[in-house]
Interface confidence: medium
């Protein structure tokens, strides 16, 4: 028998520095977790102790903190090189700055293979990107070889900016011929490494003949065997075992997100490359693991330029940006309108001639808006200003919901109106009318939404059985502020870009902003 140790990360999202337990900014260092310096300590410890070790990343290193805003992926290449990753799969967020923003800072600079079998380049891009990412890579490990085959969510064109010259194929259809090719090369130990979410990971394990292990990402899935060491609730045991269509037991793993855990999976293969056993658990990277001093020093060096960025002007406002709780928790506020407009603008994807855009709606809990911005400071807006408005380090995500769920959400928005509670919704692409004289749960008297399948966008009544795409904070997607109906009834959830980054990009693009209160949210009494 031959034993392989797979160390894996996924959805790190720019958390190069250690973070608090909820993966936001580290405040009390003695309680902080993760970060590349701590990760390196643990990886090195395992590399010294065990003979056959692979360090893999399942995508979405890009996007999530000011590190990505400033360094745009160069930080990913540099620190992944320093940690000596063996391979990485492309995630959807790796395309957030377009194909050029992937090629220049990451693909050209990475000293490890970057993989995806289901992304095919066409047109002029084909020759430009040729060889910079691969469908698979055969890696020597000790006296053996291991094949790593990559995959990426086929929803990427709706979630990011890959452009028109990359085709995202069905994962299973694309993976099978590449695995077959590896078999003809006498590679009998094959890992599928990719970024399509836990449901697709399980399907790959079931359907793709010849895949021995699946290492996934995208859905931030936490798996654990035994008592979990932190706040995350396991979605299943680690590894999650899938019985393939040809009767093999295929371990599937994921390691939550944000570099909080290091996935640790030990696989035993027989001489024909069959998995005999698999066991392990994610390792919580808490403060009991010291940060490696040389990587930490490197992080400190790179930090020097970040501090200065946060005070630079992004753009100007010529109006007061009312982010006060007195406004945003009671009525339409122009800060809420600004943020929602930025959220929609960040998700413009012209992928179908029938649709002007794939999503037109935004909802945002008023309690998530934490500060106004005064225009009398020469109109200047900085990252620092925006960090006061959106201090929680969340993301603006894409979900699919039925109209009936949205109706429930808007009823919840005003079910205890008047108590300055955070669930009051700010909106974009939605016109809502409330009648507060009616009993809670029956206060939404009009709910119109902006069409997407139209050349001239206009507002139509919400249809209860129709499925709608909505951009919202991850806080709401996870049921925060009492929006349990969103969490329980959402049909799809894809994590998006860092909240401050979305708004800062929009302000930089617009240069001068003047959001108004324009009748998106209205109150009435009496019959309709």
């Amino acid at each position: 028998a031959w034993e392989l140790t797979i160390l894996h990360t996924n959805d790190v999202h720019s958390r190069l520095e250690q973070t608090s337990e909820d993966s936001s900014k580290c405040v009390n260092a003695s309680r902080c977790m993760g970060g590349v310096a701590r990760l390196f300590t643990k990886v090195q410890q395992i590399r010294r102790a065990e003979p056959n070790v692979l360090l893999l990343d399942a995508g979405d290193q890009y996007q999530g903190t000011i590190w990505f805003t400033v360094y745009k992926g160069a930080e990913v290449a540099h620190f992944m090189n320093a940690l000596r990753y063996d391979a990485m799969a492309l995630g959807n967020h790796e395309f957030d700055n377009g194909v050029e923003g992937l090629i220049e800072p990451l693909l050209k600079e990475a000293k490890f293979p970057i993989l995806s079998a289901n992304i095919k380049a066409k047109g002029p891009l084909a020759s430009q990107i040729s060889g910079l990412y691969l469908p698979y890579k055969v890696l020597p490990v000790g006296d053996e070889v291991v094949g790593i085959v990559g995959y990426t969510s086929k929803e990427t064109p709706f979630l990011s900016n890959p452009g028109t010259n990359l085709v995202f194929e069905d994962e299973i259809t694309a993976l099978q011929p590449e695995v077959d090719k590896l078999k003809t090369l006498n590679v009998n130990k094959i890992i599928a490494l990719g970024h399509s979410g836990f449901e697709m990971d399980k399907l790959i394990a079931q359907k793709v003949r010849g895949v021995d292990v699946v290492v996934g990402g995208h859905s931030n899935t936490f798996l654990y065997t035994g008592n979990p060491p932190s706040k995350e609730v396991p979605a299943g045991k680690y590894p999650f075992i899938v019985t393939s269509d040809d009767g093999r037991k295929v371990p599937v793993v994921q390691a939550y997100a944000f570099g909080k855990y290091l996935g640790y999976l030990k696989i035993e293969f027989d001489e024909r490359g069959n998995v005999i056993s698999s066991h392990g658990n994610p390792i919580l990277l808490n403060s009991s693991i010291p940060e490696d001093p040389s990587i930490k020093a490197d992080i400190n060096k790179w930090r020097i330029k970040l501090d200065n960025y946060s005070t630079q002007e992004l753009g100007k406002t010529i109006v007061y940006l009312d982010g006060s709780s007195q406004s945003c928790r009671f009525r339409e506020c122009n800060m809420g309108n600004l943020i929602c407009d930025a959220m929609i603008n960040n998700n413009l994807r012209h992928t179908d001639e029938m649709f002007w855009n794939h999503v037109s709606m935004c909802i945002l809990n008023g309690g998530g808006i934490r500060s106004p911005i005064d225009e009398r400071n020469n109109g200047t807006i900085t990252w620092e200003n925006l960090a006061a408005v959106l201090p929680f380090g969340g993301t603006f995500d894409l979900v699919q919901l039925k109209g009936s769920t949205l109706k429930k959400a808007f009823e919840h928005s005003v079910h205890r109106y008047g108590q300055s509670t955070g669930e009051f919704l700010q909106v974009g692409g939605i016109h809502v009318v409330y009648d507060l004289s009616r009993k809670p749960g029956d206060r939404v008297v009009k709910l119109d939404v902006l069409c997407t399948k139209c050349r001239v966008p206009s507002y139509d009544p919400l249809k209860m059985d129709e499925v709608y795409k909505v951009i919202l904070p991850n806080f709401l997607a996870n049921g925060g502020d009492g929006f349990q109906m969103i969490k329980d009834e959402l049909l799809r959830h894809d994590s998006g870009d860092q909240d401050i980054n979305v708004v800062s990009t929009y302000i930089s693009k617009m240069k001068v902003i003047y959001p108004a209160v324009e009748g998106r949210i209205k109150f009435s009494t009496g019959s309709h």
Epitope: V70, A74, E104, P105, P293, A297, N300, K301, W302, I304
Partner: antibody, heavy 122, light 111 residues
Framework: QVQLVQSGAEVKKPGASVKVSCKAS????????ITWVRQARGQRLEWIGD????????NYNEKFKTRVTITADKSTSTAYMELSSLRSEDTAVYYC???????????????WGQGTLVTVSS | EIVLTQSPATLSLSPGERATLSCRAS??????????MHWYQQKPGQAPRLLIY???NLESGIPPRFSGSGYGTDFTLTINNIESEDAAYYFC?????????FGQGTKVEIK
């Protein structure tokens, strides 16, 4: 090999502006900071500011903040430094330099342009 | 801003001798075991050339007779077995915080 080639000498009147260019080659332009430094005769080198071409982020010395603009054109791998409201004490050799911040050099200036003499005289 | 003071202003040596140049920072420029101090050589009419980065690391292509040391606020550039081609100005520079600053320079003359 890494090269930074700057534009030629300039003579300007007080109150005018000057824009100096710095064309980079031999490395990934978008991944390293470009710094601008000046040296007046007999004076110490003075850090003006820098730019990260990958994102266009800039840092400026407070002394020059109101008068200097540093930009970068990714398509031509060229950085620019524009100084306005020139006065006689701005007469100096202006250098661009590549910072080694993506390797262990950490913001040490590992490659320099040849320098551009800017003379401000009425 | 951090002020760097170099001494001596001028150093006159014969070939084969050792040159010791000093740079003192008005504030600590070291952290986590790293010192953000660098040394450059500049000859008349030429751009500066990086000699030493992070206080003690020799830049590639620089002869090993150049070395650097120091931590905190006091740093030294040493040139062993000095040669006539080493006649130049030598500057220190820190990168601990913005703005980065330079020392006023030490002129090294060869007799």
């Amino acid at each position: 090999q890494v090269q930074l080639v700057q534009s030629g000498a300039e003579v300007k009147k007080p109150g005018a502006s000057v824009k100096v260019s710095c064309k980079a080659s031999g490395y990934t332009f978008t991944s390293y900071w470009i710094t601008w430094v000046r040296q007046a005769r007999g004076q110490r080198l003075e850090w003006i500011g820098d730019i990260y071409p990958g994102s266009g982020n800039t840092n400026y010395n407070e002394k020059f903040k109101t008068r200097v603009t540093i930009t970068a054109d990714k398509s031509t791998s060229t950085a620019y430094m524009e100084l306005s409201s020139l006065r006689s004490e701005d007469t100096a050799v202006y250098y661009c330099a590549k910072e080694g911040g993506l390797t262990t050099e950490d913001y040490a200036l590992d490659y320099w342009g040849q320098g551009t003499l800017v003379t401000v005289s009425s | 801003e951090i002020v760097l003071t170099q001494s001596p202003a001028t150093l006159s040596l014969s070939p084969g001798e050792r040159a010791t140049l000093s740079c003192r920072a008005s504030k600590n420029v070291s952290t986590s075991g790293y010192s953000y101090m660098h040394w450059y050589q500049q000859k008349p009419g030429q751009a500066p050339r990086l000699l030493i980065y992070l206080a003690s690391n020799l830049e590639s292509g620089i002869p090993p007779r150049f070395s650097g040391s120091g931590y905190g606020t006091d740093f030294t550039l040493t040139i062993n077995n000095i040669e006539s081609e080493d006649a130049a100005y030598y500057f220190c520079q820190h990168s601990r915080e913005l703005p980065f600053t330079f020392g006023q320079g030490t002129k090294v003359e060869i007799k």
